[in-house]
């Protein structure tokens, strides 16, 4: 888990500026699976590869996000890059987080959790990260993960690091993060829900 996100980022960072622009334009018209929304044009066109990766994963989750990215790359004539992306996403899987009942086998999440949908905004706007870490420690975060997030220098980088672990999380783990957010920054959760 997390491998697909890294593979998407790797592919997008290997595009030239012109290719990245073309990728975004194609993304605006590519056919989507039923039930998935399109990333708004205004936000999309100004994104760099890192922000676009985050947006793809938050809108479409890792599996479908990688598939969609590969389809667009293929449509651009970048067959080899598309093949590499799909090959990278089909290797390996992550361990279950600490303290939560793991499912018998991993399964694609058909519903988008609040945490996934608002990933970019949470990275940008959460300030009380230490409090979140304490709330999640031992339940969702291992000691190693806890220390890795704390080691980051800024709140956005802390949140970005925290979100690097979420692809391995199940629904209940995300619920615990959301609960912690409600308790520490309820105004932010309210604002995002309204949006």
């Amino acid at each position: 888990m997390g491998r697909a996100r890294d593979a998407i980022l790797d592919a997008l960072e290997n595009l030239t500026a012109e290719e990245l622009k073309k990728f975004k334009l194609k993304l605006l018209s590519v056919p989507l699976r039923e039930g998935y929304g399109r990333i708004p044009r205004g936000a999309l066109l100004s994104m760099d590869a890192l922000d676009l990766t985050d947006k793809l994963v938050s809108f479409y989750l890792e599996t479908y996000g990688a598939e969609l990215t590969a389809n667009v790359l293929r449509d651009m004539g970048l067959q080899e890059m598309a093949g590499q992306l799909q090959a990278a996403t089909h290797q390996g899987s992550g361990a279950a987080p600490a303290g939560i009942q793991a499912p018998p086998q991993s399964a694609a999440k058909p519903g988008l959790h609040f945490i996934d949908q608002h990933r970019a905004a949470l990275i940008a706007r959460v300030t009380n990260v230490e409090w979140l870490l304490d709330a999640l420690y031992g339940k969702v975060l291992t000691d190693e993960q806890y220390q890795a997030v704390r080691a980051e220098p800024t709140n956005p980088s802390k949140m970005r690091k925290l979100f690097s672990f979420t692809p391995a999380w199940n629904w209940t783990c995300k619920d615990l993060l959301l609960q912690a957010l409600r308790e520490s920054q309820s105004y932010l959760v309210e604002d995002l829900e309204r949006s």
Epitope: A102, G111, H113, C173, L178, R182
Partner: antibody, heavy 122, light 107 residues
Framework: QVQLVQSGAEVKKPGSSVKVSCKIS????????IHWVRQAPGQGLEWMGY????????MYNEKFQGRVTITADKSTSTAYMELSSLRSEDTAVYYC???????????????WGQGTLVTVSS | EIVLTQSPATLSLSPGERATLSCHAS??????LSWYQQKPGQAPRLLIY???NLHTGIPARFSGSGSGTDFTLTISSLEPEDFAVYYC?????????FGQGTKLEIK
């Protein structure tokens, strides 16, 4: 329309286990959490926990931790609640319930099963 | 866990009167509170969610308000079918908890 149909009433001995089922129809089973709430005779409502069938993960009320197991069978769109080490105070009506929506985990229960009476008696 | 305390335990009113039911939370739950109606032998029925949102199909005489720790369910003019037990429930944090209920009975 959304329907939650529960299994029939059960009479159990203290120390034994009970497994109550909740068959779901009218929506995609894997898209929403399913919760279990119980109500002892003449008493209030008590949340026991939930399962998210999309990934099989479950969360429990710590009061029941170790005694309750909530599972889901995607092939039959059925959720199950098993309670072990039964005692007389577990005599209650057990309800399965589905939230209005699960996206933001605001668990307001808009859809309920008809309830299953579990009587624990020696 | 968050404790919800409902008051009064029993409320005796006549049809046509206004009913005001209260729910107090032991800590701040923002607006994450819902209200249910339950009649004997039936499952609870969602009336209000997120403090003030009226659930689909619920008559407009029901309304909810409040935030933080104090919440109110108001029934503007009681109909005979409104006499039942009412529960509040918080969705702020786990475990989810319910109030002990207010019985609304005919005077």
């Amino acid at each position: 329309q959304v329907q939650l149909v529960q299994s029939g009433a059960e009479v159990k001995k203290p120390g034994s286990s009970v497994k109550v089922s909740c068959k779901i129809s009218g929506y995609s089973f894997t898209d929403q959490t399913i919760h279990w709430v119980r109500q002892a005779p003449g008493q209030g409502l008590e949340w026991m926990g939930y399962i998210y069938p999309g990934d099989g993960s479950a969360m429990y009320n710590e009061k029941f931790q170790g005694r309750v197991t909530i599972t889901a069978d995607k092939s039959t769109s059925t959720a199950y609640m098993e309670l072990s080490s039964l005692r007389s105070e577990d005599t209650a009506v057990y309800y399965c319930a589905r939230p209005l929506y699960s996206y933001a985990s605001y668990y307001w229960f808009a859809y309920w099963g008809q309830g299953t009476l579990v009587t624990v008696s020696s | 866990e968050i404790v919800l305390t409902q008051s009064p335990a029993t409320l005796s009113l006549s049809p046509g009167e206004r009913a005001t039911l209260s729910c107090h939370a032991s800590q701040n739950i923002n607006v994450y509170l819902s209200w249910y109606q339950q009649k004997p032998g039936q499952a609870p029925r969602l009336l209000i969610y997120k403090s003030s949102n009226l659930h689909t199909g619920i008559p407009a005489r029901f309304s909810g308000s409040g935030s933080g720790t104090d919440f109110t369910l108001t029934i503007s003019s009681l109909e005979p079918e409104d006499f039942a037990v009412y529960y509040c429930q918080q969705g702020q944090s786990y475990p989810l908890t319910f109030g002990q209920g207010t019985k609304l009975e005919i005077k």
